[in-house]
């Protein structure tokens, strides 16, 4: 809303609030070793951290959610840290007829917000 | 991914998994009573509940997140329940020059998934 101001400074201290973090993962970790051929190691950016009141609110709904969580914490959950956008990544994988390249648009997070 | 199958049945029992729930809220609850004139009571559908492994996965990223959370629960958070779509709502509010109607497209959740 025009009357709520999402904030970008973390009141909990450095690295505690919702942010993008790189997680190394092998194809084995993902259970993909039987069908993905390359890359064999992925840098998976993920959204981690807490969402204190009005921090990086995704939209009006998230601002309302934060407000109502303050009033009814048992009934309304706090907003949580999820991807706001993604970076495409190309995977080479086996198919019935051989090998194929495919772009995945929703695999690696590029930015995060509180929703 | 082609090798992960999001599921829609909740393994935790009825009403425990990610779902849409209606929360009644007054303008006072939202801190909007000074600028929103109507409606004076809102039905705010919100996404609540847990996101067990592969339940209503938003996309490939969410499936990966669920998998890595199982492997590294301290490092990778579980997916969480957030809106997948919204229902518009028209608010009448005061402006500097009088009264205005405005459609908010991101205020009331219409569907939920685990991201």
């Amino acid at each position: 809303s025009a009357h709520a101001h999402p904030r970008d400074s973390c009141p909990l201290g450095p690295g505690r609030c919702c942010h993008l973090e790189t997680v190394q993962a092998t194809l084995e970790d993902l259970g993909w070793s039987d069908w993905v051929l390359s890359p064999r190691q992925l840098q998976l950016s993920m959204c981690v951290g807490e969402c204190p009141h009005l921090y990086r609110s995704a939209n009006t709904h998230a601002q309302i959610k934060a407000r109502l969580h303050g009033l009814q914490p048992d009934k309304v959950p706090a907003p949580c840290c999820v991807p706001s956008s993604y970076t495409p990544v190309v995977l080479m994988h086996r198919t019935d007829s051989g090998v194929s390249l495919q772009t995945y648009d929703d695999l690696v997070a590029r930015g995060c917000h509180c929703a | 991914s082609a090798h992960a199958h999001p599921r829609d049945s909740c393994p935790l029992g009825p009403g425990r998994c990610c779902h849409l729930e209606t929360v009644q809220a007054t303008l006072e609850d939202l801190g909007w009573s000074d600028w929103v004139l109507s409606p004076r009571q809102l039905q705010l559908s919100m996404c609540v509940g847990e996101c067990p492994h592969l339940y209503r996965s938003a996309n490939t990223h969410a499936q990966i997140k669920a998998r890595l959370h199982g492997l590294q629960p301290d490092k990778v958070p579980a997916p969480c329940c957030v809106p997948s779509s919204y229902t518009p709502v028209v608010l009448m509010h005061r402006t500097d020059s009088g009264v205005s109607l405005q459609t908010y497209d991101d205020l009331v959740a219409r569907g939920c998934h685990c991201a």
């Epitope: - | 209606t22 109507s38 039905q43 709502v89 028209v90 009448m92």
Partner: antibody, heavy 118, light 112 residues
Framework: QVQLVQSGAEVKKPGSSVKVSCKAS????????ISWARQAPGQGLEWMGG????????NYAQKFQGRVTITADESTSTAYMELSSLRSEDTAVYYC???????????WGQGTMVTVSS | DIVMTQSPLSLPVTPGEPASISCRSS???????????LDWYLQKPGQSPQLLIY???NRASGVPDRFSGSGSGTDFTLKISRVEAEDVGVYYC?????????FGGGTKVEIK
């Protein structure tokens, strides 16, 4: 420009039910509330109830509580008003109208005549 | 329930002349936000009602500026500065402060 198009006239027996529909043509409900009112022949307007987005629960006038059910289907942009246990006094033109909450009813349906007669 | 009382019941008018309709509520329609939760509607013969004024004094989109609403609390007035032939019909005030929403009994405006 959105118009609200209501279902056709009905003749009903006392004790039966009627369900009137109200479809947004040329658009959707677009986040507006839907109110229902009625007008008995030669009489004034009487508010029955309404429903606001996300169209999950309705608000009814105490007079009609237990007899009226207002619903809306966003996928078809159609609202419904069902009135049960009809009596002759329910003979009226029934209107749907869109508003902001219960205020500012700026688009009205053409009305549906419901006649209750044995 | 809030009772809305309109006067007069019938108002014969001359085209080009002003006209005034009164509406009284059994309790104040002034909200703590400073706005009066009162609308005015016109129902032309054989037609559905149409919105003229909302929140006591705000003209609805497309409504000619010869229509104006005033008043606060329990006493409200709809004025037509210069009546035109197309203004005939029944005028209703409606309170939206609390449910059930209630309408006045109507004022029938007709050409003399």
């Amino acid at each position: 420009q959105v118009q609200l198009v209501q279902s056709g006239a009905e003749v009903k027996k006392p004790g039966s039910s009627v369900k009137v529909s109200c479809k947004a043509s040329g658009g959707t409900f677009q986040g507006y509330a839907i109110s229902w009112a009625r007008q008995a022949p030669g009489q004034g307007l009487e508010w029955m109830g309404g429903i606001i987005p996300p169209y999950a629960t309705a608000n009814y006038a105490q007079k009609f509580q237990g007899r009226v059910t207002i619903t809306a289907d966003e996928s078809t942009s159609t609202a419904y008003m069902e009135l049960s246990s009809l009596r002759s006094e329910d003979t009226a033109v029934y209107y749907c109208a869109r508003g902001v909450g219960e205020l500012h009813l700026d688009v009205w349906g053409q009305g549906t005549m419901v006649t209750v007669s044995s | 329930d809030i009772v809305m009382t309109q006067s007069p019941l019938s108002l014969p008018v001359t085209p080009g002349e002003p006209a005034s309709i009164s509406c009284r509520s059994s309790q104040s329609l002034l909200h703590s936000n400073g706005y009066n939760y009162l609308d005015w509607y016109l129902q032309k013969p054989g037609q559905s009602p149409q919105l003229l004024i909302y929140l006591g004094s705000n003209r609805a989109s497309g409504v000619p500026d010869r229509f104006s609403g005033s008043g606060s609390g329990t006493d409200f007035t709809l004025k037509i500065s210069r009546v035109e032939a197309e203004d005939v019909g029944v005028y209703y005030c409606m309170q939206a402060l609390q449910t059930p929403i209630t309408f006045g009994g109507g004022t029938k405006v007709e050409i003399k």
